[in-house]
């Protein structure tokens, strides 16, 4: 019979990118296991990750049902084996997570430049519309399909021969910018959701430079 009492989880943290959403917590279990429950403000508590010794739980399947809802999770601690529980009167120990609204809080993943084409003094840069784990009628939706006009991109570009940077913005997945004919350019893009108060911008895409081995058209 063990002597280590069950302890409540702490540091409950949401980790979410493009709606792939994982709840993490501490501590690593010693003589205990966890079960996670998730709920909307108006909904019922649904158990996930039953009797696990992990300190994370993938809740994507639940939050993608309605990404504009606000979710709350809680982590229950149960004694493993014949260990005493510290819960009073048979009440299980649990800790609540912060609230999480996927639409407002999921990180936007690093964008990818799908292709670029130069024609004279115009350069067209296309950003790949990444798929999310949100489904509609059995089909995965793209970022653009989920966010619509709330999603924009910022292009940062410069001449290969210069360090002076310029920026352009778009509410679509394409940029059409004026360039000097015959010059090569380097550029990267960043996703942005201007209406947000947190996680407004993604990390920058890898920098692409024209005239390198990849060629001027990349799919």
């Amino acid at each position: 019979s063990g002597t280590t009492n069950t302890v409540a989880a702490y540091n409950l943290t949401w980790k979410s990118t493009n709606f792939k959403t994982i709840l993490e917590w501490e501590p690593k279990p010693v003589n205990q296991v966890y079960t996670v429950q998730i709920s909307t403000k108006s909904g019922d508590w649904k158990s996930k990750c039953f009797y696990t010794t992990d300190t994370e739980c993938d809740l994507t399947d639940e939050i993608v049902k309605d990404v504009k809802q606000t979710y709350l999770a809680r982590v229950f601690s149960y004694p493993a084996g014949n260990v005493e529980s510290t819960g009073s009167a048979g009440e299980p120990l649990y800790e609540n997570s912060p609230e999480f609204t996927p639409y407002l809080e999921t990180n936007i993943g690093q964008p990818v430049i799908q292709k670029y084409e130069q024609g004279g003094t115009k350069l067209k840069v296309t950003v790949k519309d990444s798929f999310t784990l949100v489904r509609k009628n059995g089909t995965f939706l793209t970022l653009r399909q989920v966010f619509g006009n709330d999603l924009g991109y910022i292009l940062t570009y410069r001449k290969s021969s210069s360090s002076g940077k310029k920026t352009a913005k778009t509410n679509t997945n394409e940029f059409l910018i004026d360039v000097d004919k015959g010059e090569n350019y380097c550029f990267s893009v960043q996703a942005v959701i201007p209406s947000r108060t947190v996680n407004r911008k993604s990390t920058d895409s890898p920098v692409e430079c024209m005239g390198q081995e990849k060629g001027e058209f990349r799919e």
Epitope: V33, W45, K46, S47, F50, F76, Y78, P92
Partner: antibody, heavy 121, light 107 residues
Framework: QVQLVQSGAEVKKPGASVKVSCKAS????????MHWVRQAPGQGLEWMGI????????VYAQKFQGRVTMTRDTSTSTVYMELSSLRSEDTAVYYC??????????????WGQGTMVTVSS | DIQMTQSPSSLSASVGDRVTITCQAS??????LNWYQQKPGKAPKLLIY???NLETGVPSRFSGSRSGTDFTFTISSLQPEDIATYYC?????????FGGGTKVEIK
């Protein structure tokens, strides 16, 4: 095919212990939780606890805490349930039952045939 | 512990009848409910999981539904081989708990 085969009936005296075995075959032993459920004569079903064969972690219903021990032997794909300090109320059929896949994680989709344990002086 | 109140405790119906069993949870358990069939002297058999999903190989005359904390198990057309005791089981909260069972007999 997937099956769970349990050890035979036992007759025990009050205060003694009993150890029931459950041998799994036809699936990857480590990938599914195993539960123990008992049923007293003419009564309903009662969940006793769960063991994760992968790491051997167990969780018991509070009612059995301190009296039950669930173990597993991965080399023979067998789980064991030992109940100590037996009393007459422990007379029951003891079942092992496999927890389902991730789709139905805590639904018991495969059951052993049951082991009758009689506690009598 | 979550109490699962199953009713009726027994019923008698004719072959071809529609049979309904209910299970009420003492608190919200989402759709984390399973239904089992147990024939005399045999181990239980899983019929329905997650309130309404039919286990592979189970005849389509068996079905399950949920309304809040009330769960319904239905046999659309009772067959002689359906004579058994039926149990509900919740798994949303520890410990897992069963209903008291409903014994179904043929008139």
């Amino acid at each position: 095919q997937v099956q769970l085969v349990q050890s035979g009936a036992e007759v025990k005296k009050p205060g003694a212990s009993v150890k029931v075995s459950c041998k799994a075959s036809g699936y990857t032993f480590a990938n599914y939780y195993m539960h123990w459920v008992r049923q007293a004569p003419g009564q309903g079903l009662e969940w006793m606890g769960i063991i994760n064969p992968s790491g051997g972690i167990t969780v018991y219903a509070q009612k059995f805490q301190g009296r039950v021990t669930m173990t597993r032997d991965t080399s023979t794909s067998t789980v064991y349930m030992e109940l100590s300090s037996l009393r007459s109320e422990d007379t029951a059929v003891y079942y092992c039952a496999r927890g389902g896949s991730k789709v139905a994680a805590l639904a018991f989709d495969i059951w052993g045939q049951g082991t009758m344990v009689t506690v009598s002086s | 512990d979550i109490q699962m109140t199953q009713s009726p405790s027994s019923l008698s119906a004719s072959v071809g009848d529609r049979v309904t069993i209910t299970c009420q949870a003492s608190q919200d358990i989402s759709n984390s409910l399973n239904w089992y069939q147990q024939k005399p002297g045999k181990a239980p058999k899983l019929l329905i999981y997650d309130a309404s999903n039919l286990e592979t190989g189970v005849p389509s005359r068996f079905s399950g539904s949920r309304s809040g904390t009330d769960f319904t198990f239905t046999i659309s057309s009772l067959q002689p081989e359906d004579i058994a005791t039926y149990y509900c089981q919740q798994y949303n909260f520890h410990p897992l708990t069963f209903g008291g069972g409903t014994k179904v007999e043929i008139k």
